[in-house]
Amino acid sequence: ESGYAQNGDLEDAELDDYSFSCYSQLEVNGSQHSLTCAFEDPDVNTTNLEFEICGALVEVKCLNFRKLQEIYFIETKKFLLIGKSNICVKVGEKSLTCKKIDLTTIVKPEAPFDLSVIYREGANDFVVTFNTSHLQKKYVKVLMHDVAYRQEKDENKWTHVNLSSTKLTLLQRKLQPAAMYEIKVRSIPDHYFKGFWSEWSPSYYFRTPEINNSSGEMD
């Protein structure tokens, strides 16, 4: 097969660092899966570079990635999800670097959504709820969630809570009164599938009641 780079191009190419990372998202668009790869060095000259995946596919031996700006991706139903695939950076027919990867070990879930916080006056607590598209999925159903919250004025003092459900109760006495809080949540595969944290959900902001002077409790 043709498509070879000029010799000089290849010599230059071999001086570069073509290390890359990838993540998969299963059933991200109906029954379609996606695979996204990018170079770890943002300054790599990606002109004439392509990504190709071979093995552990249905119907075809290899697939070419689509390039969008500086990321490369595939969206397809045709991942076998059993065994390892070989993902290569190519110039024409020449492979510059390759990785053998099981796509079930690089799963990045979709970000949780519909995060909200409701104050229960009688119970003196806050009920945090959120949703995840993974409840409806066939493959990556079981997730660990990381709820992070902070007082808005505390730039980097996040408190993290790990949970497997989509509901969390925060006790009022654990929070500062009359304060504005920011809360967000992300997810990671927790059963069979392995991988990475999702993106964070959009943040939700809520205010704690002031202290009721007579009882010492918050209003």
Epitope: E1, G3, V58, E59, V60, K61, C62, L63, N64, R66
Partner: antibody
């Protein structure tokens, strides 16, 4: 609607050259792998060449490798096949064809041109 | 390279008959198989891909099946417009390859 129109066929002597063109419309050429497929008179279909959506990868069977070159000009909505060192056995109707699926490389073809006849004879 | 063996090369049948065409590959193509119909002087038309997925607009009397190295195109009740030549094609790997064709003629 999707259209593929081949041109450039004709009579050429053995050892000669010919350049086929395929003008496409009704879809974004840069999204698709494209292929040339030929059919000798009274014979079956034979795959001749494929070019990736980006144009960076080209594929050929042994029967034409080194003699034929596939290329594309997405800006001109055109696919080409440069045929050199032509032989009598290259005589065929040449079709350009578009895969059903965009990107990636699933090479089954839902749109075909009407074909252009190439005759190699002295 | 993957070899394609299509059979029969021709067959005679009547309107209403059930027709079966087979395609055997020299190695597992993991359902990377398509079927086409071609009429004289015309370009081929895609009927089936992924071994068993009917292309949009193709009548439901056509069906594809198979896995591994053995694949079948079935016409459940042959219609007058179905008399044509049929080709299988593997797209699992390069070089892409077509079967030799099956000409379906009127008995």
């Amino acid at each position: 609607q999707v259209q593929l129109v081949e041109s450039g066929g004709g009579l050429v002597k053995p050892g000669g050259s010919l350049r086929l063109s395929c003008a496409v419309s009704g879809f974004t050429l840069s999204d698709y792998y494209m292929a040339w497929i030929r059919q000798a008179p009274g014979k079956g279909l034979e795959w001749v060449s494929t070019i990736s959506a980006s144009g960076l990868r080209t594929y050929y069977p042994d029967s034409v490798k080194g003699r034929f070159t596939i290329s594309r000009d997405n800006a001109k909505n055109s696919l080409y096949l440069q045929m050199n060192s032509l032989r009598a056995e290259d005589t065929a109707v040449y079709y350009c064809a578009r895969p059903l699926s965009a990107h990636y490389g699933f090479n089954y073809f839902d749109y075909w041109g009407q074909g252009t006849l190439v005759t190699v004879s002295s | 390279d993957i070899q394609m063996t299509q059979s029969p090369s021709s067959l005679s049948a009547s309107v209403g008959d059930r027709v079966t065409i087979t395609c055997r590959t020299s190695e597992d193509i993991y359902q990377g198989l398509a079927w086409y119909q071609q009429k004289p002087g015309k370009a081929p038309k895609l009927l089936v891909y992924s071994a068993n997925t009917l292309h949009i607009g193709v009548p439901s009397r056509f069906s594809g099946s198979g896995s591994g190295t053995d694949y079948t195109l079935t016409i459940s009740s042959l219609q007058p417009e179905d008399f044509a030549t049929y080709y299988c094609q593997q797209y699992y790997d390069y070089p892409l390859a077509f079967g030799g064709g099956t000409k379906v003629e009127i008995k």
